[in-house]
C-alpha cells in the first residue's frame, strides 16, 4: 500500500481467483484514543473499534471511503483504491490502446516546436467518475522539471455505438533550450482513476522525436501565363521555432482531386513556393516536417484550384 | 559564444552542402545498423545515449544563434578554446566566435572519425563480418573537415590488444550512430543558418 | 493487370510527320496522366509531353513545343503522339507511360521504333 | 532545364556483391528523382520513386538515397537479373529530365 495523495490510498493486489488479497491496517488521524468507530462508504454499518483497523483487501467491495467516527463526529477518512496487478501485468482497463504508433501506445503527444512544450492526450469510453493527474520531467534518476496542467475533457467522439472520450495536458520544460541536443528523455506518467480503480500510464520520448509543426499559412497562388501551371506560395507557422534559418523546414506540396485514388501533382522543396499543375475541382495543399531530422509531417493546408 | 550575423556571401558557404551529406550518410548507415543489427538494442528507445565530445567539445553553444542568445536556457555553456583558421570562413567579416563555432565543428568530426575508424577494425575482425561502417559515411566526415581546413593535433587512432567484445562493438556503434546523427543534425541547421545570414 | 500496348515499328521521310498510338488496357483510361518520351539508340530517355485524358489538357517540353501534338480519345482508351517536319535525329523509340503521378511514370508501353530515313 | 548526370556510365560488379550508382542534379531538385532498370529491347521499370520510397514488387536490395543534388541507387547484392541500365529522373520542374544511364555489367 502506498499514499497518492492525503488520505488517498492505492493498495497494489494480485488479481486472481482465490486470491488471498493484503492485509491493510488503516490508524485513525485523532490524538482520542477510546470509542472511536468505524465505517466503509455510506453504510452505518460498524465494521471495528479502536485506533486502528485491520482488514482484508481482496476485491473492490473491500476498497472504499473508510471513515472512523467518535459520538457522531467524523474524525478522519481513508479513501483506499486498487491497482490490479494480473499475470504480473498492471491493468489498463481505463484507457483505451491507441496502437498508434505501436501497440500498447495509450499516451500520445506532440509538439509543435522545439521549445519545450508538448501536449499529450489518451481516450476512454468511461464517462464519469474519472480523474487523472499528470507528472513530468526530463530523466529519472536525476529528473529536471517539467509543469504540466490540468488534464482536460478536449473532444468527444461516437465510434459505433460508443462515445469515445478524448483527455488532453499541456506541459512546459521549465529551462528549455530550442538549441539543444537531448539526452535524457521527456518521462510523462498519467495517473487514473475510476471510480476506486487505480491505474498509471507512462510515455518516454525525446522533443525531437514527436515533432509536428502546425500546417504552413498563408498559401497563395499565382497562374502561370500560357501554361497550365500555378505558383503556389506559403509562410513557415507562426508556431514554429525561431530563426527559421537555423529552424529549417522542408515542404511537400500536392494538387489532387476530393477522392484519395485520383491522380495528383506532387513536388517536394526546401522553399516556400513551387510550381504546380492545377485541375478543375481540385485543392492545392502544402504540408511541413522539419527539414533536418524526420520527424511527423503537419496536417495539410489547402485552397481550392479554382 | 553565438554566431554572429555577418558571415559569408549567400550560397557562397562551402560548408554547406558537406553537411548535407553527412547527415544524410549518418542516417543511412543508422538505418542500416537498425537493419542489420535487427536483434541488438539498436533503437533510440533502447540504446543509452551518451555523447562522446561531452565536456570536450561545446558546438550547441558555440554555435548558438545570435536570435537564441537572449534565451537563458541556453547559455549555461562550458568555456572551451578552439584554434581559428579555417577555409569555411570566406569571408574577412567572419568573427571570433564563428571560428570559435567551426572550430568545435571540426573537433567532433575528428573525435567520431577516430572513434568510427576505430570501431571498423574491430568489426572487421568479426568472424560473422556482420556489419561494417560505410566509407562513404567516413569519407563525408573527411570531405567536411578538409572543408574546414582546421590545423589541429592528430588524434593517435585506439588500438586494443585484448579480444574485442563484438556484441559490445556493434551495441557501441548504435550508440555512436544514434549520437552522431544528433551532431549532424546540428552541424546542418548551423551550416543552413550561416549559409543565409 | 495494367497494359500500355503501342502501335508497329514505322519507316519515315525526313519532312513528313509520324503518328504512334497507345491503348491502355486495365485501370480507367482517365484515372492517369499519360506521358510519351523517346530513346535514341545508344542514347539516354527524353521526355516529349503529357496529356491528362480526362480534360484533354497537356504540356510539352520546349524541345517539342510546336512539332509534337498529344491528344487521347477516352472511348477507346488510346493516346496518340504526333511528331512533325521528321529528321534524322528523330529515329528512336517512343515510348507511352503513366501513372496517377504527374512526374514519373510507374507502367510503360513496350515502344514502338521509328526510323527517319530518306 | 535541369541536367541529370550519372557517375560512373558503366560499371563492372561481381554477382552477389553490391552496387551503387550516382546521380547529380544541376540544381537543387530535394526528393523528386526517380530511378528506373531498363534490360536491352524492354521498356524501363520504375524501381524508387522520390529519391527512396520503395516500389511494390521491387525486390528490397534495391534502395535509394539523397536529397539536394547528390543522389544514390545501392543494389545490396547483384543478381543475375540485376544486370541492366540504370536511369535516374527529375520531377522538380518541368521539363521532366533523365541521367545518361548507368550500365551495370558482369565483372
Known amino acids: 500500500i502506498w499514499e497518492l495523495k492525503k488520505d488517498v490510498y492505492v493498495v497494489e493486489l494480485d488479481w486472481y481467483p482465490d486470491a488471498p488479497g493484503e492485509m491493510v491496517v488503516l490508524t485513525c488521524d485523532t490524538p482520542e484514543e477510546d470509542g472511536i468507530t468505524w465505517t466503509l462508504d455510506q453504510s452505518s454499518e460498524v465494521l471495528g473499534s479502536g485506533k486502528t483497523l485491520t482488514i482484508q483487501v481482496k476485491e473492490f467491495g473491500d476498497a472504499g471511503q473508510y471513515t472512523c467516527h467518535k459520538g457522531g463526529e467524523v474524525l478522519s477518512h481513508s479513501l483506499l483504491l486498487l491497482h490490479k496487478k494480473e499475470d504480473g501485468i498492471w491493468s489498463t482497463d481505463i484507457l483505451k490502446d491507441q496502437k498508434e504508433p505501436k501497440n500498447k501506445t495509450f499516451l500520445r503527444c506532440e509538439a509543435k516546436n522545439y521549445s519545450g512544450r508538448f501536449t499529450c492526450w489518451w481516450l476512454t469510453t468511461i464517462s464519469t467518475d474519472l480523474t487523472f493527474s499528470v507528472k513530468s520531467s526530463r530523466g529519472s534518476s536525476d529528473p529536471q522539471g517539467v509543469t504540466c496542467g490540468a488534464a482536460t475533457l478536449s473532444a468527444e467522439r461516437v465510434r459505433g455505438d460508443n462515445k469515445e472520450y478524448e483527455y488532453s495536458v499541456e506541459c512546459q520544460e521549465d529551462s528549455a533550450c530550442p538549441a539543444a541536443e537531448e539526452s535524457l528523455p521527456i518521462e510523462v506518467m498519467v495517473d487514473a482513476v475510476h471510480k476506486l480503480k487505480y491505474e498509471n500510464y507512462t510515455s518516454s520520448f525525446f522533443i525531437r522525436d514527436i515533432i509536428k509543426p502546425d500546417p504552413p499559412k498563408n498559401l497563395q497562388l499565382k497562374p502561370l501565363k500560357n501554361s497550365r501551371q500555378v505558383e503556389v506560395s506559403w509562410e513557415y507557422p507562426d508556431t514554429w521555432s525561431t530563426p527559421h534559418s537555423y529552424f529549417s523546414l522542408t515542404f511537400c506540396v500536392q494538387v489532387q482531386g476530393k477522392s484519395k485514388r485520383e491522380k495528383k501533382d506532387r513536388v517536394f522543396t526546401d522553399k516556400t513556393s513551387a510550381t504546380v499543375i492545377c485541375r478543375k475541382n481540385a485543392s492545392i495543399s502544402v504540408r511541413a516536417q522539419d527539414r533536418y531530422y524526420s520527424s511527423s509531417w503537419s496536417e495539410w493546408a489547402s485552397v481550392p484550384c479554382s | 559564444r553565438n554566431l554572429p550575423v555577418a558571415t559569408p556571401d549567400p550560397g557562397m558557404f562551402p560548408c554547406l552542402h558537406h553537411s548535407q551529406n553527412l547527415l544524410r550518410a549518418v542516417s543511412n548507415m543508422l538505418q542500416k545498423a537498425r537493419q542489420t543489427l535487427e536483434f541488438y538494442p539498436c533503437t533510440s528507445e533502447e540504446i543509452d545515449h551518451e555523447d562522446i565530445t561531452k565536456d570536450k567539445t561545446s558546438t550547441v553553444e558555440a554555435c548558438l544563434p545570435l536570435e537564441l542568445t537572449k534565451n537563458e536556457s541556453c547559455l549555461n555553456s562550458r568555456e572551451t578554446s578552439f584554434i581559428t583558421n579555417g577555409s569555411c570562413l570566406a569571408s574577412r567579416k567572419t568573427s571570433f566566435m564563428m571560428a570559435l563555432c567551426l572550430s568545435s565543428i571540426y573537433e567532433d568530426l575528428k573525435m567520431y572519425q577516430v572513434e568510427f575508424k576505430t570501431m571498423n577494425a574491430k568489426l572487421l575482425m568479426d568472424p560473422k563480418r556482420q556489419i561494417f561502417l560505410d566509407q562513404n559515411m567516413l569519407a563525408v566526415i573527411d570531405e567536411l573537415m578538409q572543408a574546414l581546413n582546421f590545423n589541429s593535433e592528430t588524434v593517435p587512432q585506439k588500438s586494443s590488444l585484448e579480444e574485442p567484445d563484438f556484441y559490445k562493438t556493434k551495441i557501441k556503434l548504435c550508440i555512436l550512430l544514434h549520437a552522431f546523427r544528433i551532431r549532424a543534425v546540428t552541424i546542418d541547421r548551423v551550416m543552413s543558418y550561416l549559409n543565409a545570414s | 493487370q495494367v497494359q500500355l500496348v503501342q502501335s508497329g515499328a514505322e519507316v519515315k521521310k525526313p519532312g513528313s510527320s509520324v503518328k504512334v498510338s497507345c491503348k491502355a488496357s486495365g485501370g480507367t483510361f482517365s484515372d492517369y496522366y499519360l506521358h510519351w518520351s523517346r530513346q535514341a539508340p545508344g542514347q539516354g530517355q527524353e521526355w516529349m509531353g503529357w496529356?491528362?485524358?480526362?480534360?484533354?489538357?497537356?504540356e510539352y517540353a520546349p524541345k517539342f513545343q510546336g512539332r509534337v501534338t498529344i491528344t487521347a480519345d477516352e472511348s477507346t482508351s488510346t493516346a496518340y503522339m504526333e511528331l512533325s517536319s521528321l529528321r534524322s535525329e528523330d529515329t528512336a523509340v517512343y515510348y507511352c507511360?503513366?501513372?496517377?503521378?504527374?512526374?514519373?511514370?510507374?507502367?510503360w508501353g513496350q515502344g514502338t521504333l521509328v526510323t527517319v530515313s530518306s | 532545364d535541369i541536367v541529370m548526370t550519372q557517375s560512373p556510365l558503366s560499371l563492372p560488379v561481381t554477382p552477389g556483391e553490391p552496387a551503387s550508382i550516382s546521380c547529380r542534379a544541376s540544381q537543387s531538385i530535394s526528393i523528386n528523382l526517380h530511378w528506373y532498370q531498363q534490360k536491352p529491347g524492354q521498356q524501363p521499370r520504375l524501381l524508387i520513386a522520390f529519391a527512396s520510397q520503395s516500389i511494390s514488387g521491387v525486390p528490397s536490395r534495391f534502395s535509394g538515397s539523397g536529397s539536394g543534388t547528390d543522389f544514390t541507387l545501392t543494389i545490396s547484392s547483384l543478381q543475375p537479373e540485376d544486370f541492366a541500365t540504370y536511369y535516374c529522373q527529375q520531377s522538380n520542374s518541368f521539363p521532366l529530365t533523365f541521367g545518361q544511364g548507368t550500365k551495370v555489367e558482369i565483372k
Open positions: 507511360a503513366r501513372n496517377k503521378e504527374l512526374r514519373y511514370f510507374d507502367v
Open positions: 496529356i491528362d485524358p480526362e480534360n484533354g489538357d497537356t
